[in-house]
Interface confidence: medium
Amino acid sequence: EVEKTACPSGKKAREIDESLIFYKKWELEACVDAALLATQMDRVNAIPFTYEQLDVLKHKLDELYPQGYPESVIQHLGYLFLKMSPEDIRKWNVTSLETLKALLEVNKGHEMSPQVATLIDRFVKGRGQLDKDTLDTLTAFYPGYLCSLSPEELSSVPPSSIWAVRPQDLDTCDPRQLDVLYPKARLAFQNMNGSEYFVKIQSFLGGAPTEDLKALSQQNVSMDLATFMKLRTDAVLPLTVAEVQKLLGPHVEGLKAEERHRPVRDWILRQRQDDLDTLGLGLQGGIPNGYLVLDLSMQEALS
């Protein structure tokens, strides 16, 4: 912490300007009024203070606002935001999307830091839900943002926000997250026609149930193998050979290359070998002809 010393004669800051970069730390502490700093925060970002000098400026703001900074100051923190701890940020009440954008811009190009994660958490909790504009902003800065949320947090995403989601935003989502997002996407895109609907829903299909995959197989969608491989195994297993053939269209040939990987491997084990043979791909491992298949799960459900 900087010692309290009197400001030398003639050095009292009348405004926040570039001449202050030549002030020693103790001079900044003694000669810059915290209230002046707060009202002229927008200037700080355009002045290349060293990070040791920024420590002094932060200290002054902390003394002025022990309960947390007002949004008028937060919006103009600029590089000073990088000095904030998650504990500092938990004291803030950030409601403006412009403030959020301004602070995310400072951290642009870096990994999501604990400070940014705390900021986003405060912002979203303050809004009550993850609306479309917020999601638009967050995924623009952090494509993986959506997949960093828990299924419980994702449940607060309104279907209307799904329009903001790009395929790359879902790259790191696991099946539990897609289970939550898929029904929202289905609802959001329900009024689109067949081919347009498939383009939009494709990224979310890792959360689709069997009945929806069966319905898609009737629509000539030509699903690519990469999408098929991300489907839930339990949703793929009940599909017939004919349904998978219709679902994949010309991409069905790709099954051969994936026959040792889930969900293709598990699906093959559930199909009759003679049905698999109709594909002409040389897929092996199906149920031999003449064997009876008992669906025990169905029997348990009936008893």
Epitope: E18, I21, F22, K24, K25, A46, I47, P48, T50, Y51, E52, Q53, Y79, L82, K83, H110, S113, Q115
Partner: antibody, heavy 121, light 107 residues
Framework: QVQLQQPGTELVKPGASVKLSCKAS????????MHWVKQRPGQGLEWIGH????????NYNEKFKSKATLTVDKSSSTAYMQLSSLTSEDSAVYYC??????????????WGTGTTVTVSS | DIVMTQSQKFMSTTVGDRVSIICKAS??????VAWCQQKPGQSPKLLIY???NRYTGVPDRFTGSGSGTDFTLTISNMQSEDLADYFC????????TFAGGTKLEIK
């Protein structure tokens, strides 16, 4: 990748001026301050000053205030330093360098290729 | 202005040596010090920032230490490609200042 390209040499007469360029590529020019540093043979480096490409703001080492003038051209992602009233003392290699800052660090991460200025009649 | 001093202008070394280069600041600069390497005819290259953080891609034989006024750059296993000038720089306050540098030479 990030590069700062400078002309190799400038031969100038005493009393004349020279304008050195530093062309940036591989990053958003307006997002980083550009600094200029002087290096004379057998001597240490001296910080001349810096410019803020986003708004043209500048700061100078007191020693170079009447010697150097820093400008930027955003459209060509180029920083310039004009040196005036040249004497043999100004013969040196001049570097531009990009200044990066984060939460608890700052440094010159990329240096220009350097321009050798020779003042001779 | 803060004066940075590297008292040893030259140091003789051999491959495999452990080399320590000392840098002193005229006043407390915290950890706001960087170390650079410069080979003849080339631009400086960043090795260490914030006194002890190795920059991306820098071999781990280079380490930085110190805070306040005394700083050290150590090369734990000297290699022939490490023959160069090394200088420290402070960025605690303006004007930014550099030490004169230490040139490593082969014995």
């Amino acid at each position: 990748q990030v590069q700062l390209q400078q002309p190799g040499t400038e031969l100038v007469k005493p009393g004349a001026s020279v304008k050195l360029s530093c062309k940036a590529s591989g990053y958003t020019f307006t997002s980083y301050w550009m600094h200029w540093v002087k290096q004379r043979p057998g001597q240490g480096l001296e910080w001349i000053g810096h410019s803020n490409p986003s708004n043209g703001g500048t700061n100078y080492n007191e020693k170079f205030k009447s010697k150097a003038t820093l400008t930027v051209d955003k459209s060509s992602s180029t920083a310039y330093m004009q040196l005036s009233s040249l004497t043999s003392e100004d013969s040196a290699v001049y570097y531009c360098a990009r200044w990066v800052r984060g939460s608890n660090y700052e440094y010159f991460d990329v240096w220009g290729t350097g321009t050798t200025v020779t003042v001779s009649s | 202005d803060i004066v940075m001093t590297q008292s040893q202008k030259f140091m003789s070394t051999t491959v495999g040596d452990r080399v320590s280069i000392i840098c002193k600041a005229s006043q407390n600069v915290g950890s706001a010090v960087a170390w650079c390497q410069q080979k003849p005819g080339q631009s400086p290259k960043l090795l260490i920032y914030s006194a002890s953080n190795r920059y991306t891609g820098v071999p781990d034989r280079f380490t930085g230490s110190g805070s306040g006024t005394d700083f050290t750059l150590t090369i734990s296993n000297m290699q022939s490609e490490d023959l160069a000038d090394y200088f420290c720089q402070q960025y605690s306050s303006y004007p930014l200042t550099f030490a004169g540098g230490t040139k490593l030479e082969i014995k």
